[in-house]
Amino acid sequence: VPGEAEQPAPELVEVEVGSTALLKCGLSQSQGNLSHVDWFSVHKEKRTLIFRVRQGQGQSEPGEYEQRLSLQDRGATLALTQVTPQDERIFLCQGKRPRSQEYRIQLRVYKAPEEPNIQVNPLGIPVNSKEPEEVATCVGRNGYPIPQVIWYKNGRPLKEEKNRVHIQSSQTVESSGLYTLQSILKAQLVKEDKDAQFYCELNYRLPSGNHMKESREVTVPVFYPTEKVWLEVEPVGMLKEGDRVEIRCLADGNPPPHFSISKQNPSTREAEEETTNDNGVLVLEPARKEHSGRYECQGLDLDTMISLLSEPQELLVNYVSDVRVSPAAPERQEGSSLTLTCEAESSQDLEFQWLREETGQVLERGPVLQLHDLKREAGGGYRCVASVPSIPGLNRTQLVNVAIFGPPWMAFKERKVWVKENMVLNLSCEASGHPRPTISWNVNGTASEQDQDPQRVLSTLNVLVTPELLETGVECTASNDLGKNTSILFLELVNLTTLTPDSNTTTGLSTSTASPHTRANSTSTERKLPEPESRG
């Protein structure tokens, strides 16, 4: 055909997969009547009639485009729906009158690939390999046309480098016509690459312009020989008895060598292997002062059988020994003096203080507590606290009970108890003294004694309320070798109008408890035994 060589370049129409391509027939009125047009697709230089326009009416030809073509824009534009990669070809429209002319359109199809999927080589890479080893694989699925891949290390693009970096890319065509790209990065790595971040980037084009997608960043296991092993202790800082202490071996190689932790025997000066947990960590829980000493770590490379030894590390578990108070169980006469001395050993400087157990009041700062002109009230608990001020929480204490010789001291002198006749009464009476007193009652009933502490006793009596009992009341008498003392319980009948906070009735059986609400007080009186008494 004359003048075929000067054919103009086809008009470019760009569209994404799945969308609609609008193919506008660019014939001018002079070149042909648009009401009489044939549309062709050109594939491998073979043209196939796909659509014809007659008197402005369109008709698809049977074949692959039959269902996807329609006429728009008063017959000037052919719309192709559901574009696929296979639609990337030349379309042409041909006018029949006044003479045969044609207009060519190049359809370009695009599809963004999915997010690139990066997989690191799980086996890792030794640093001393002779040639590049597989670092990671990048896969970009379902893109069109084939995207470009760029590999990055620590944010910098990698280029092919002989014997150092090799990028091996391949692609497959899916049944959809889309491409899946696979790119393998091979490289020779060095020890410093153990923390290197690798990722791949896919570059692709869309009708809107150039785009890119990045994979996540990955690190690759890099294997390199151990040059140094060392010990690490947690927690850092001052350790104390009772702490959970972890001693672990660390090495600068990967994989780490087989570790063993040894402690120097202070007697033999020889290293003795300690038992570690499954992670190779020596856990001291609770840490004791005996754990103090010199520790070292041995790392054995099981491939080369090369053994490395760490620098020894001194571990100090600070402690306070058991606190000793002397005398341990002091007994003193009223009016006498007592010196309590507190002793303890520690790995650090100690501070001592004495507290009154009952009140928590600090009596003395220092190891020695001097008590003068002892009164009965001075009896009871004194606590020595030995602490290490530089290590919070490191302290030990010892309680000492000071016993002041004396006849029994009653918790109350007398008390009124509200009762009902025929009720079973539960009475209690408390006395203290040294030696510890015994308690007796002046009425028959079921009595039981409970020792409250070394100098204090509580007696409980269950007794039936009778008219005689109401008249006489109840007495409890506490006695020891130094004297005796009595408490009186007055029984008063409850009538319905009387409020009775001390008694409660349950299923017809009433129980009343008369027991001291406070520690012994000064209302009690002491009576020396009127005459010597023999008891078995």
């Epitope: 007994e331 006469q333 016993a403 030696p435 502490d453 070394p454 070798d481 010597p532 023999s534």
Partner: antibody, heavy 118, light 111 residues
């Protein structure tokens, strides 16, 4: 120094009586309890009785009640154990010992041997 | 009466050994933190000597190799490193109530 010294032991015929003495020195006699503990030859220790010199209160092992009697002479700081109706099984070393109100014996005399034999 | 049972009745050991003697009471001899159990050493022809009082307190002048422990009904006297002068008979005694009773004794002999 703190000391307890027993005396009065010896050989005595069955059914007879004997009085043992325990002299105390070096401490305030009336502030402590004095006990008698005996030990038969080759046997263990057996607590007999106690007295508190400050009040003269005595306690006895039930086994010796009515047979042994404790007394005290505060002016002499001396304790006595009167033993009646002695039998062969009363043959023992008799010790006096001191205690406080927790009843452990921190000071002991050297003991005096009583042999009941016909 | 509270019965005191010592074990063993006799024991052979060597100088430097660690020795443990136990004493079991037929009922508890402890009151709120205080255990009324005491230990004595007796050598032939001599009076007993107090070693440990109230279960764990070392009597003044007694070497620190002696220690006591326990509460309730079970108590232990330990000699950490036996010395030649420690070969003797050892007794436990309770003072929880009357009558006070002693264990039958443990004779510690040289092996």
């Amino acid at each position: 120094q703190v000391q307890l010294v027993e005396s009065g032991g010896g050989v005595v015929q069955p059914g007879r009586s004997l009085r043992l003495s325990c002299a105390a020195s070096g401490f305030t006699f009336s502030n402590y309890w004095i006990h008698w503990v005996r030990q038969a030859p080759g046997k263990g220790l057996e607590w007999v009785a106690r007295i508190y010199p400050g009040t003269d209160i005595t306690y006895y092992n039930e086994k010796f009640k009515g047979k042994f009697t404790l007394s005290v002479d505060n002016s002499k700081n001396t304790l006595y154990l009167q033993m009646n109706s002695l039998r062969a099984e009363d043959t023992a070393v008799y010790y006096c010992a001191r205690s406080g109100g927790y009843w452990y014996f921190d000071v002991w005399g050297a003991g005096t041997m009583v042999t009941v034999s016909s | 009466d509270i019965q005191m049972t010592q074990s063993p009745s006799s024991l052979s050991a060597s100088v430097g050994d660690r020795v443990t003697i136990t004493c079991r009471a037929s009922k508890s001899v402890s009151i709120s933190g205080y255990s009324y159990m005491h230990w004595y050493q007796q050598k032939p022809g001599k009076a007993p000597k107090l070693l440990i009082y109230l279960a764990s307190n070392l009597e003044s002048g007694v070497p620190s190799r002696f220690s006591g422990s326990g509460s309730g009904t079970d108590f232990t006297l330990t000699i950490s490193s036996l010395q030649p002068e420690d070969f003797a008979t050892y007794y436990c005694q309770h003072s929880r109530e009357l009558p006070y009773t002693f264990g039958q004794g443990t004779k510690l002999e040289i092996k």
